[in-house]
């Protein structure tokens, strides 16, 4: 009789342990769901506000034709500037035409005045060729005016209405670029 009671007690204890484990799993699952829900809500909120505004560019970005531009309010070296743009789903500015250059320099004059802004242009150390970040060559009219006398890597920046070059490790503002969202209307 005592053995039977002991066996039942052990079975009950085992069942209790299993229930505790299940409860722990459920709590963990619930927490995970809550976290996912938070992400989803934030994502939906962004999507809805974007859809509601139907704005082709995010807040604080400037639109010109098919592009959105972000003019930074902080200084950083060229490589960090590129990473900062990537976090926002963009790349450093790639100037395709004189019209785009004019728009950028005109906008900068209105916003901040005559400062230095990194763009996505760098000089290959071996060949000395200037290339945009996607590997394409700048059009002849969009080459940096002065050759930097630097033994280090050289990168391009915009100042006033000129493209210039400087040691990539100097600190400057920067400009990011992404595609404008097409209106679905």
């Amino acid at each position: 009789k005592l053995l039977q009671v002991s066996t039942i007690a052990m079975q009950q204890q085992e069942k209790l342990i299993q229930q505790e484990r299940a409860l722990l799993n459920f709590t963990e699952w619930k927490r995970s769901c809550a976290l996912q829900m938070k992400y989803c809500q934030a994502f939906m909120q962004n999507s809805l506000s974007s859809a509601h505004n139907s704005s082709p560019c995010p807040n604080n970005w400037i639109q010109n034709r098919e592009s959105c531009y972000y003019v930074s309010e902080i200084w950083s070296i060229w490589h960090t500037s590129q990473e900062n743009c990537l976090k926002e789903g963009s790349t450093l500015l790639q100037i395709e035409s004189k019209e785009e250059m004019d728009f950028i320099t005109g906008s900068l004059r209105k916003i901040k005045g005559s400062y230095d802004y990194w763009v996505g242009l760098s000089q290959d150390g071996h060949s000395g060729r200037w290339l945009w970040q996607d590997g394409s060559s700048p059009s002849p009219g969009l080459l940096p005016a002065e050759r930097s006398q630097s033994a280090n890597q050289v990168c391009g920046y915009v100042k006033s209405n000129s493209l210039l070059s400087s040691n990539c490790s100097t600190w400057k503002y920067f400009i990011c670029e992404k595609y404008a969202l097409r209106s679905s209307v």
Partner: nanobody
């Protein structure tokens, strides 16, 4: 959280090609761009190539014209096609997810190019 898993590394001869893959899982909608970094022994980790969700690309000067980054959105995977490999490309290659709230890294895959 976001998990990134690299594959495709290995030992090859100079001039050969390799294709690295980075599979992303988890809360990937927080990721705005994906990139490949590399770290050679005794050197700093450097950005090799990156691609945004819109398909805009960026490359390090040393790999322009040799490496190509691409993505397959259906598979949540980013690829790095490495052609004309040089001994200087020997390094551990890491996949990185760029997000406004933080960055996510993979464990890395070793690429060794022998001369």
């Amino acid at each position: 959280q976001v998990q990134l898993q690299e594959s495709g590394g290995g030992l090859v001869q100079a001039g050969a090609s390799l294709r690295l893959s980075c599979a992303a899982s988890g809360s990937i909608f927080s990721i705005n761009a994906m990139g490949w970094y590399r770290q050679a022994p005794g050197k700093q980790r450097e950005l090799v190539a990156a691609i945004t969700n819109q398909g805009r690309t960026t490359y390090a000067d040393s790999v322009k014209g040799r490496f190509t980054i691409s993505r397959d959105n259906a598979k949540n995977t980013v690829y790095l096609q490495m052609d004309s490999l040089e001994p200087e490309d020997t390094a551990i290659y890491y996949c990185k997810g760029f997000s406004p709230t933080g960055d996510y890294w993979g464990q890395g895959t070793q690429v060794t190019v022998s001369s």
